[in-house]
Amino acid sequence: AITEAREEAKPYPLFPGPFPGSLQTDHTPLLSLPHASGYQPALMFSPTQPGRPHTGNVAIPQVTSVESKPLPPLAFKHTVGHIILSEHKGVKFNCSISVPNIYQDTTISWWKDGKELLGAHHAITQFYPDDEVTAIIASFSITSVQRSDNGSYICKMKINNEEIVSDPIYIEVQGLPHFTKQPESMNVTRNTAFNLTCQAVGPPEPVNIFWVQNSSRVNEQPEKSPSVLTVPGLTEMAVFSCEAHNDKGLTVSKGVQINIKAIPSPPTEVSIRNSTAHSILISWVPGFDGYSPFRNCSIQVKEADPLSNGSVMIFNTSALPHLYQIKQLQALANYSIGVSCMNEIGWSAVSPWILASTTEGAPSVAPLNVTVFLNESSDNVDIRWMKPPTKQQDGELVGYRISHVWQSAGISKELLEEVGQNGSRARISVQVHNATCTVRIAAVTRGGVGPFSDPVKIFIPAHGWVDYAPSSTPAPGNADPVLII
């Protein structure tokens, strides 16, 4: 049976009884090998008589002495089987064996949980020689035990390639409970149940768990570790921790905050990054997410003109990257812009509204009803048109650009004229006779040049022809009208 020794027990005797060969307590060791830097198995030098191989944990010598008495089987002496002590205490234990002097080159090594202990362990092997046998004591000490020192320790001795193994010495290091699983912070839906888990281990066992919510014990009775706390639901933020108790005392887990998911706060700092005639690039700083990730955002745009109908345009976008280009806006217009974002709980309120304006743009349509006719008397071409609708001018008209292309007998040349915004007619000199003149007109604002009107062609005859009628912008579907006079 395993004997058990608690840390309060008196020091263990090195071995239960005297060694064969009547080892006296006043003998001093012949050889003492402390292993400081690296573990070196102790070598025992004895008279050179070979031992025989054996099987198992006991070596049965086959050699007989001069009187032909058989040698006893070799085995480690029984020692303490179980040592229980607290963390950071010191411990020393040993293996002992008596080896007939006929054996040579014996080595003792320490093993823990099946692995040889190499390195800076405090292992000392002492030899006490006598006439027929040498008593060997292998001591192992740990100055400040830790949980990692828990385990089963054995001695192994090699004699002529045969192995003798001692009984195990179980070291049990006891201390305060050690958490293997602590509760985790969570974001939960209001009034919805959730679980928290806490697990701690000894030794010593058992480990009992108490849950604490906002500094108040939750469970009246301790629960054996591991413990799962089911919280039926919260209406406000709470802090949970768990206490782990064993016979050595108490360890408290980290406190974790359980947050209640809520609608987000409205975005802040909505700002204009860039404006064009028909788009505005905005950015914003997201508000507090309400402990639930943002899903998407909504940009609300309304015309700031008091005469507008007050309708709101809504643009939906992803929550990232807190940037959105609002398109399809009118040029040179004022808008109020607000941003709202949503998480799984719902939509935030709208951010504070900001005012933004689009810039002037090039007109979006060409002048209308372009007509061209030849004034033969002055050798000019007269051009007339209607200005584009105000809404589609996309700014303040500063004038018009007229393109007239003259084509005759394989020669073509284009001329551009700029005219002021006043009026809606222009006159250009005939450049080439017996040629076709193609006219296109574009409106111009400070924002740029708009699209050119559809081409209107007029044939300019040689001198002496009569001016009958104008050419005009074709009706849709008609191509390249040519008026030959």
Epitope: N208, V212, Q213, S215, S216, R217, V218, E220, Q221, P222, E243, H245, L250
Partner: antibody
Framework: QVQLVQSGAEVKKPGASVKVSCKTS????????MYWVRQAPGQGLEWMGI????????TYAQKFQGRVTMTRDTSTSTVYMELSSLRSEDTAVYYC??????????WGQGTTVTVSS | EIVLTQSPGTLSLSPGERATLSCRAS???????LAWYQQKPGQAPRLLIY???SRATGIPDRFSGSGSGTDFTLTISRLEPEDFAVYYC?????????FGQGTKVEIK
């Protein structure tokens, strides 16, 4: 570890009230379940009630319902047991106890209440 | 409420002897939530056993608890002089929590 220290002995007249205090020392940042138990001279233990630390809910034994009030002052880590309409049979040692590591494993030293005209 | 009946009322034994104390409940005790306390004159009770069979910290292993449902037992394997006292069982599985009337262990 937690210790419970109770107020001193009281002598009361029948019909009066008594308020016994029980101060927690040690781990005062946690509010524990608190119990009150009494023991009349030469008699056994009698459970009076429990003060739950969550919202300070209380459960009283039927026998004391309407006469006993258990409260907590978090700022001083003290719980109180007030017993009203005292009778001579309320003469007893009153104990507070708590669950620290195991159920009711820490007890106060007891407060003797004597009801005598 | 659950009524706990302890027997015997008094147990007269000598040091070194084994003491067996019984506690019977009028109905099943939930989760075996039954505790045993020791009380000496002029002192507060001291928890020995909780959960019917688990020893509290610092309680010598000569004290052991057993039983379930309605029948529970406290055993002191070898009485020491300091073990002579009154022992109470208490159920804490339902309200009101109730105590047995006690068993006095006295020196024979």
């Amino acid at each position: 570890q937690v210790q419970l220290v109770q107020s001193g002995a009281e002598v009361k007249k029948p019909g009066a009230s008594v308020k016994v205090s029980c101060k927690t020392s040690g781990n005062t940042q946690i509010r524990y379940y608190m119990y009150w138990v009494r023991q009349a001279p030469g008699q056994g233990l009698e459970w009076m009630g429990i003060l739950n630390p969550n919202q300070d809910q209380t459960t009283y034994a039927q026998k004391f319902q309407g006469r006993v009030t258990m409260t907590r002052d978090t700022s001083t880590s003290t719980v109180y047991m007030e017993l009203s309409s005292l009778r001579s049979e309320d003469t007893a040692v009153y104990y507070c106890a708590t669950t620290y590591r195991y159920y009711m494993d820490v007890w106060g030293q007891g407060t003797t209440v004597t009801v005598s005209s | 409420e659950i009524v706990l009946t302890q027997s015997p009322g008094t147990l007269s034994l000598s040091p070194g002897e084994r003491a067996t104390l019984s506690c019977r409940a009028s109905q099943s005790v939930r989760s075996n939530y039954l505790a045993w306390y020791q009380q000496k004159p002029g002192q507060a009770p001291r928890l020995l056993i909780y959960g019917a069979s688990s020893r509290a910290t610092g309680i010598p292993d000569r004290f052991s608890g057993s039983g379930s449902g309605t029948d529970f037992t406290l055993t002191i394997s070898r009485l020491e002089p300091e073990d002579f006292a009154v022992y109470y069982c208490q159920q804490y599985g339902s309200s009101p929590r109730t105590f047995g009337q006690g068993t006095k262990v006295e020196i024979k």
